[in-house]
């Protein structure tokens, strides 16, 4: 008979997740030799010690420290790039300027990107069956924590001039309860982040409006200034066009203003 | 086959200055990682200086940080090791080595020495 | 600049096995490979074991490596008399973004 298995509301860890994450760890440390010593299976190791065997609503910050001391790495002041609701243009951004960073570019958060996973209370099991949802389950879940401990943790060590891309075509353009708004807003550190500036990425392609009047990005820069941070805001009317002029700054079409 | 031949080093007064090269062969030079590591008489290996390969990025041992400067020239197969401000504790046999894929030192050359004497 | 722990000597008969410690930290031999060297005075050092665990061609396969947490080994069985010589580990150290070195272990062939 099949053990019984706590039936969660989530879907289940990503298949072949050991896997996926080695896999990752190896191709990441190929491509950038300044991580050419990391020892991949040391890495999952850790990641693996932060939920195996740990109920997955019980999950701490603590948990993943094993993990996150590992994965060390600093980007350059003024080349971390936050972002809310706008994954992928951000991605596609810093894979045009690569001396700018995602969380993603850095190794754990390329371990983990768009994977799922959990363990079992008291076996050493992966659940690929389900994990616990955010909402309906519990925020404490190995996947939350992860996401909250190294989005925390790069905040902190980001320094210089910070910049955030942010959906313009949301209703809250800035959500305090995005993880930009609830962990990575207040891990800045004003004593390293001289400014942070905000990208207001447009959808519509006749959206000629000031996003960065919206009553969200007034509120983004009272948190940020109470902290003693400038805030600059831009918007970002032609995302494609934005995109083709990183690729190609000399561009006629570019080079006004 | 892979040769490494150091030279530039000799006596010299503290204080003074020395800058050590290493002609590299046998293997493409500019693809790779190149390092300086240490042993002084009686002592064990020293990591010093490392310099990677394309836009070259430079590392140094917190021991030889602001004196040393690492530095290469693919051009001409060679690496350099500028040392200022030498003290006597830099006195050492100086190895210049050649790091594989996986941060390993594969390839030594024998070694020049360095004696820094009044 | 802290360096890896190694015993100071090791020794064995020949044909014994001889394992030699190396003990570091969570920020080089916890999270980096871990290398080991041997060195006969007067020559360059050679490359005995990478990768934790890996020989380069060449090296007999009496030689092996392992790691386990902040730790590792060198196994040298079958001991011969040209095994004589300092063996020294090394990994990369993330905090001092740099390498770390043992500070070399004596092998005697009794």
């Known amino acids: 008979l099949p053990r019984w298995r706590q039936q969660w509301s989530g879907s289940g860890t990503t298949s072949r997740f050991p896997e996926t994450v080695l896999a990752r760890c190896v191709k990441y440390t190929e491509v950038h030799p300044e991580m050419r010593h990391v020892d991949c299976q040391s890495v999952w190791d850790a990641f693996k010690g932060a939920f195996i065997s740990k109920y997955p609503c019980n999950i701490t910050e603590e948990d993943y420290q094993p993990l996150v001391k590992l994965g060390t790495q600093t980007v350059p002041c003024n080349k971390t790039l936050l972002w809310s609701r706008i994954k992928d243009l951000a991605h596609q951004f810093t894979q045009v300027q690569r001396d700018m960073f995602t969380l993603e570019d850095m190794l754990l958060g390329y371990l983990a990107d768009d994977l799922t996973w959990c363990g079992e209370f008291n076996t050493f099991e992966i659940n690929y069956q389900s994990c616990p949802d955010w909402r309906k389950d519990c925020s404490n879940n190995p996947v939350s924590v992860f996401w909250k401990t190294v989005s925390r943790r790069f905040a902190e060590t980001a320094c210089g001039v910070v910049h955030v891309m942010l959906n313009g075509s949301r209703s809250k353009i800035f959500d305090k309860n995005s993880t930009f708004g609830s962990v990575e807003v207040h891990n800045l550190q004003p004593e390293k982040v001289q400014a942070l500036e905000a990208w207001v990425i447009h959808g519509g392609r006749e959206d000629s409006r000031d996003l960065c009047q919206d009553p969200t990005i007034k509120e983004l820069e009272s948190i940020i200034s109470k902290r003693n941070i400038r805030f600059f805001c831009k918007n970002i009317y032609r995302p494609d066009k934005f995109l083709q002029c990183v690729k190609n700054p000399e561009d006629s079409s570019c080079l006004s203003g | 086959q892979v040769q490494l031949v150091e030279s530039g080093g000799g006596l010299v007064k503290p204080g003074g200055s020395l800058r050590l090269s290493c002609a590299a062969s046998?293997?493409?030079?500019?693809?790779?990682?190149m390092s300086w590591i240490r042993q002084a008489p009686g002592k064990g290996l020293e990591w010093v200086a490392s310099?990677?390969?394309?836009?070259?990025?430079?590392y140094y041992a917190d021991s030889v940080r602001g004196r040393f400067t690492i530095s290469r020239d693919n051009a001409k197969n060679s690496l350099y090791l500028q040392m200022n401000s030498l003290r006597a504790e830099d006195t050492a046999v100086y190895y210049c080595?050649?790091?594989?894929?996986?941060?390993?030192?594969?390839?030594w050359g024998r070694g020049t020495l360095v004696t820094v004497s009044s | 600049q802290a360096g890896l722990t190694q015993p100071p000597s090791a020794s064995g008969t020949s044909g014994q096995r001889v394992t030699i410690s190396c003990s570091g930290s969570?920020?080089?031999?916890?999270?980096?490979?871990v290398y080991w060297y041997q060195h006969l005075p007067g020559t360059a050092p050679k490359l005995l074991i990478y990768?934790?665990?890996q020989r380069p061609s060449g090296v007999p396969d009496r030689f092996s490596g392992s790691k386990s947490g902040n730790s590792a080994s060198l196994a040298i069985s079958g001991l011969r008399s040209e095994d004589e010589a300092d063996y020294y580990c090394?990994?990369?150290?993330?905090?001092?973004?740099?390498?770390?070195f043992g500070s070399g272990t004596k092998v005697t062939v009794l």
């Open positions: 080595a050649r790091e594989d894929w996986g941060g390993e030192f594969t390839d």
């Open positions: 046998g293997f493409t030079f500019s693809d790779d990682y």
């Open positions: 310099v990677s390969n394309g836009r070259p990025t430079t």
């Open positions: 969570s920020s080089n031999i916890g999270i980096n490979f």
């Open positions: 990768k934790n665990n």
């Open positions: 090394a990994a990369w150290d993330d905090s001092l973004s740099g390498y770390v």
